[in-house]
């Protein structure tokens, strides 16, 4: 006869491991008992359990409540046992010793591999600001046994670097994603992808990129100077910029206070019916936590009466 077992039994942390040991004997042969022991090199063999053909399973103190026989129906030639709730410390070599009649004793070894699935964590880097050089966007760390694989999934252009730390029964892998921040990256997803044989599917953690920037400011509303004449209603100036975080707007007049009746509504400066008093230099001040910008424009309100008077003067002067 001979023993049938597996070279390697693989289970995920917390699962039950079936340690197989089946005696394939000739007819009439009987199994008297099967002794299971931990057989790691460097340690004395540590008994797990003894499975007796007549008297069932007797478990060692160290494995009390954790070693069981597989559920019925049971073959009298099957010396397999179940190791409940596998932990990392269970990983190693196991030996089954089978006493048979009349063929004598047989033994076989197997290796139990306990997969420890990783629990990845993603840590964003320092605040990203446009104009910085190569900067850490995020790092992703996953520890497991065996070592997990950590990669990145993103449309953003960048570079990755990985390092691994080996512990006694596991390994921690950290991958960093570096990029040169630009405003086009704002709102883009950066996803850490962790692969491991103990996971049914890859684990993904997504980080949304935030790049601080502030665009140059400009003022719209003066495209047609002829529209800025005395008496015109609904005249307005709009300050244009964009940024992250979204900027705030402030309007001032360089050559004095804002005329009465002029309304500030965020990025917009609204005028009452125009008078020549509204002529002047207006400044839009745009700012966010990252930076500030200014844009100034000169408003020249035309007075048709003044113009015609000047023409008369000119005529008379000629």
């Amino acid at each position: 006869g001979e023993l049938e077992t597996s070279d390697v039994v693989t289970v995920v942390l917390g699962q039950d491991a079936k340690l197989p040991c089946f005696y394939r004997g000739d007819s009439g042969e009987q199994v008297g008992q099967v002794a299971w022991a931990r057989a790691d090199a460097g340690e004395g063999a540590q008994e797990l359990a003894l499975l007796h053909s007549k008297y069932g399973l007797h478990v060692s103190p160290a494995y009390e409540g954790r070693v069981e026989q597989p559920p019925p129906p049971r073959n009298p030639l099957d010396g397999s046992v179940l190791l409940r709730n596998a932990v990392q410390a269970d990983e190693g070599e196991y030996e089954c010793r089978v006493s048979t009649f009349p063929a004598g004793s047989f033994q076989a070894r197997l290796r139990l591999r306990v997969l420890v699935p990783p629990l990845p964590s993603l840590n964003p880097g320092p605040a990203l600001e446009e104009g910085q050089g190569l900067t850490l966007a995020a790092s992703c760390t996953a520890e497991g046994s065996p070592a997990p694989s950590v990669t990145w999934d993103t449309e953003v252009k960048g570079t990755t670097s990985s390092r691994s730390f080996k512990h006694s029964r596991s390994a921690a892998v950290t991958s960093e994603f570096h990029l040169v921040p630009s405003r086009s990256m704002n709102g883009q997803p950066l996803t850490c992808v962790v692969s491991h044989p103990g996971l049914l599917q890859d684990q993904r953690i997504t980080h949304i990129l935030h790049v601080s920037f502030l665009a140059e400011a400009s003022v719209r509303g003066l495209e047609d100077q002829n529209l800025w004449h005395v008496g015109r209603e609904g005249a307005m100036l709009k300050c244009l910029s964009e940024g992250q975080p979204p900027p705030s707007y402030n309007w001032t007049r360089l050559d004095g206070p804002l005329p009465s009746g002029v309304r500030v509504d965020g990025d917009t400066l609204g005028f009452p019916p125009l008078t020549t008093e509204h002529s002047g230099i207006y400044v839009c001040h745009v700012s966010n936590e990252f930076s500030s910008r200014d844009s100034q424009v000169t408003v020249d309100v035309l007075d048709p009466q003044e113009d015609s008077g000047k023409q008369v003067d000119l005529v008379s002067a000629s």
Partner: antibody
Framework: QVQLVQSGAEVKKPGASVKVSCKAS????????IHWVRQAPGQGLEWMGI????????SSAQKFQGRVTMTRDTSTSTVYMELSSLRSEDTAVYYC???????????????WGQGTLVTVSS | QSVLTQPPSVSEAPRQRVTISCSGS????????VNWYQQLPGKAPKLLIY???LLPSGVSDRFSGSKSGTSASLAISGLQSEDEADYYC???????????FGGGTKLTVLG
């Protein structure tokens, strides 16, 4: 060699407690259960209880429940049995015994301590 | 009153064969292994037979064990004076969840 060495004889008054020690050597202490068995003068053997030396979990005969406490100290490979509320009929030789046979996990006692005589007398 | 029943004493002449019986129930002998212990005067018990019929190393093959149903027996052949001792049978009891012993049998080697 494998052996269990017990503490010396004790004389106690009724109502008192006694604590007997059993020091194991020559084998992996945490790998085998330890049992306590007593024998009154001229009487037979009586099983008292069992202790798991790695977890400290115990189980005792119904007769002794509430009176017997079994503990262990893995750092010194020593098991203790304390019997409280002693009465004259507790006068006996108390033995500790290792379960297993020649390293195999069998329900039999292959190694016994030399015994500790506990005399309960007023 | 012991859970397992043994004769209080047996005697036989040297070089003869003697048998000691041990009777129990389905919760102990019927379902579990029987062990036999020898206790010489003033000494701790010594394992003689385990798992019904197996001999630990160092025990003379003059000793043998057997079991049938809820009874077990210990046989000693070629009796010698040093075999004079108390003999105890023991088994785990599923109902009591503990070991049970017989009351012991005193063997006297005559002559």
């Amino acid at each position: 060699q494998v052996q269990l060495v017990q503490s010396g004889a004790e004389v106690k008054k009724p109502g008192a407690s006694v604590k007997v020690s059993c020091k194991a050597s020559g084998y992996t202490f945490t790998s085998y259960y330890i049992h306590w068995v007593r024998q009154a003068p001229g009487q037979g053997l009586e099983w008292m209880g069992i202790i798991n030396p790695i977890s400290g979990r115990t189980s005792s005969a119904q007769k002794f429940q509430g009176r017997v406490t079994m503990t262990r100290d893995t750092s010194t490979s020593t098991v203790y049995m304390e019997l409280s509320s002693l009465r004259s009929e507790d006068t006996a030789v108390y033995y500790c015994a290792k379960e297993g046979v020649g390293g195999e996990l069998l329900r039999a006692f292959d190694i016994w301590g030399q015994g500790t005589l506990v005399t309960v007398s007023s | 009153q012991s859970v397992l029943t043994q004769p209080p004493s047996v005697s036989e002449a040297p070089r003869q064969r003697v048998t000691i019986s041990c009777s129990g129930s389905s919760s102990n002998i019927g379902n579990n292994a029987v062990n036999w212990y020898q206790q010489l005067p003033g000494k701790a018990p010594k394992l003689l037979i385990y798992y019904d019929d197996l001999l630990p190393s160092g025990v003379s093959d003059r000793f043998s064990g057997s079991k049938s149903g809820t009874s077990a027996s210990l046989a000693i052949s070629g009796l010698q004076s040093e075999d004079e001792a108390d003999y105890y049978c023991a088994a785990w009891d599923d109902s009591l969840n503990g070991f049970v012993f017989g009351g012991g049998t005193k063997l006297t080697v005559l002559g």
